[in-house]
């Protein structure tokens, strides 16, 4: 039987015949058990966590992770150097910023070290897996008697992010939401001075630099209205 050789040239599946040979079900060995899926997220392009469900293994197993980048200067196979653990069993790998190359195909291989033929290789587009930090420093400016402008900051390249603003008054049962492009500002043209407003924002790495589906966490809310400070009606900063 072949042994698994990690080769980053796109044809890393050296054990195909073993797995594709038809075998009677009573002869299936542990090496045919599927490995858990690996799910990776890149947090603000500062670090990446690739995790798997270690409890899906029939017995506690310290699975190992290798990775490389396809068709690039970084195509050398790398071992995970910083494992994440769940109940003392490997359940993930953390990669640091210098190991993240957003626009190269990321190849990740999970393997059972006790059964080297038992391996699974996935390919990922990291630019679709970026989750930015929540927006910060929300501020409200009164542009006119009835118009408010909400501004915020992101700890990332602003042009890469789109945003979702939600707001409601104390009288509302649900949030009203509005999509905002990379400009990270939002105007509410008609404000009722008798009501108290709450605003919050979240951001996503989409569509200019990637096609991420996952939003950041919500920002801390900021409030405006009848029971906020009257000392400076033109500027309210973040109220946690």
């Amino acid at each position: 039987l072949n042994t698994t050789i990690l080769t980053p040239n796109g044809n890393e599946d050296t054990t195909a015949d073993f797995f594709l040979t038809t075998m009677p079900t009573d002869s299936l060995s542990v090496s045919t058990l599927p490995l858990p899926e690996v799910q990776c997220f890149v947090f603000n392009v500062e670090y990446m966590n690739c995790t798997w469900n270690s409890s899906s293994e029939p017995q506690p197993t310290n699975l190992t992770l290798h990775y490389w980048y396809k068709n690039s200067d970084n195509d050398k196979v790398q071992k995970c150097s910083h494992y994440l653990f769940s109940e003392e069993i490997t359940s993930g790998c953390q990669l640091q910023k210098k190991e993240i190359h957003l626009y190269q195909t990321f190849v990740v291989q999970l393997q059972d070290p006790r059964e080297p033929r038992r391996q699974a290789t996935q390919m990922l587009k990291l630019q679709n897996l970026v989750i930015p930090w929540a927006p910060e420093n929300l501020t409200l400016h009164k542009l006119s008697e009835s118009q408010l402008e909400l501004n915020w900051n992101n700890r990332f390249l602003n042009h890469c992010l789109e945003h979702l603003v939600q707001y409601r008054t104390d009288w509302d049962h649900s949030w009203t939401e509005q999509s905002v492009d990379y400009r990270h500002k939002f105007s509410l043209p008609s404000v009722d001075g008798q009501k108290r407003y709450t605003f919050r924002v979240r951001s996503r790495f989409n569509p200019l630099c990637g096609s991420a589906q996952h939003w950041s966490e919500w920002s801390h809310p900021i409030h405006w209205g009848s029971n906020t400070s009257k000392e400076n009606p033109f500027l309210f900063a973040l109220e946690a």
């Epitope: 599946d13 599927p34 690996v38 190849v107 290789t121 990922l124 589906q213």
Partner: nanobody, 126 residues
Framework: QVQLVESGGGLVQAGGSLRLSCAAS????????MGWFRQAPGKEREFVAV???????FYTDSVEGRFTFSRDNAKNAVYLEMNDLQPEDTAVYYC????????????????????WGRGTQVTVSS
């Protein structure tokens, strides 16, 4: 019972094109990672192209820019458009499906796939 049936193979001259189809019955492919693999005589089965159910697509180096993987969930089918075919593309082409939890999972390892078709022969003459 799950069945994957490939079609569209044949004999073509170098530089020609073919479109392979893979139709599924007994299971919806909409949340499966899908793969095309090939096996030439006397060689290992190798991955050609893979697609997550979220739509991320990847190709082996030798077919990048020549082959295009697509899927039609309404027809429960996937396709492999092959252009500028070369004699080294001669092989039996297999379609495979892997149930996955995450929209981004795209396996290039054949042992990760649960369901396989019987294959369709592609022969490219020089």
């Amino acid at each position: 019972q799950v069945q994957l049936v490939e079609s569209g193979g044949g004999l073509v001259q170098a530089g020609g094109s073919l479109r392979l189809s893979c139709a599924a019955s007994g299971r919806s492919l909409s949340r499966d990672a899908m793969g095309w693999f090939r096996q030439a005589p006397g060689k290992e089965r190798e991955f050609v192209a893979v697609m997550s159910w979220g739509g991320d697509t990847f190709y082996t180096d030798s077919v990048e820019g020549r082959f295009t993987f697509s899927r039609d969930n309404a027809k429960n089918a996937v396709y492999l458009e092959m252009n500028d075919l070369q004699p080294e593309d001669t092989a039996v082409y297999y379609c495979a499906a892997a149930p996955t939890s995450f929209a981004t999972t795209a396996y290039s390892s054949s042992n990760s796939y649960s369901y396989w078709g019987r294959g369709t022969q592609v022969t490219v003459s020089s």
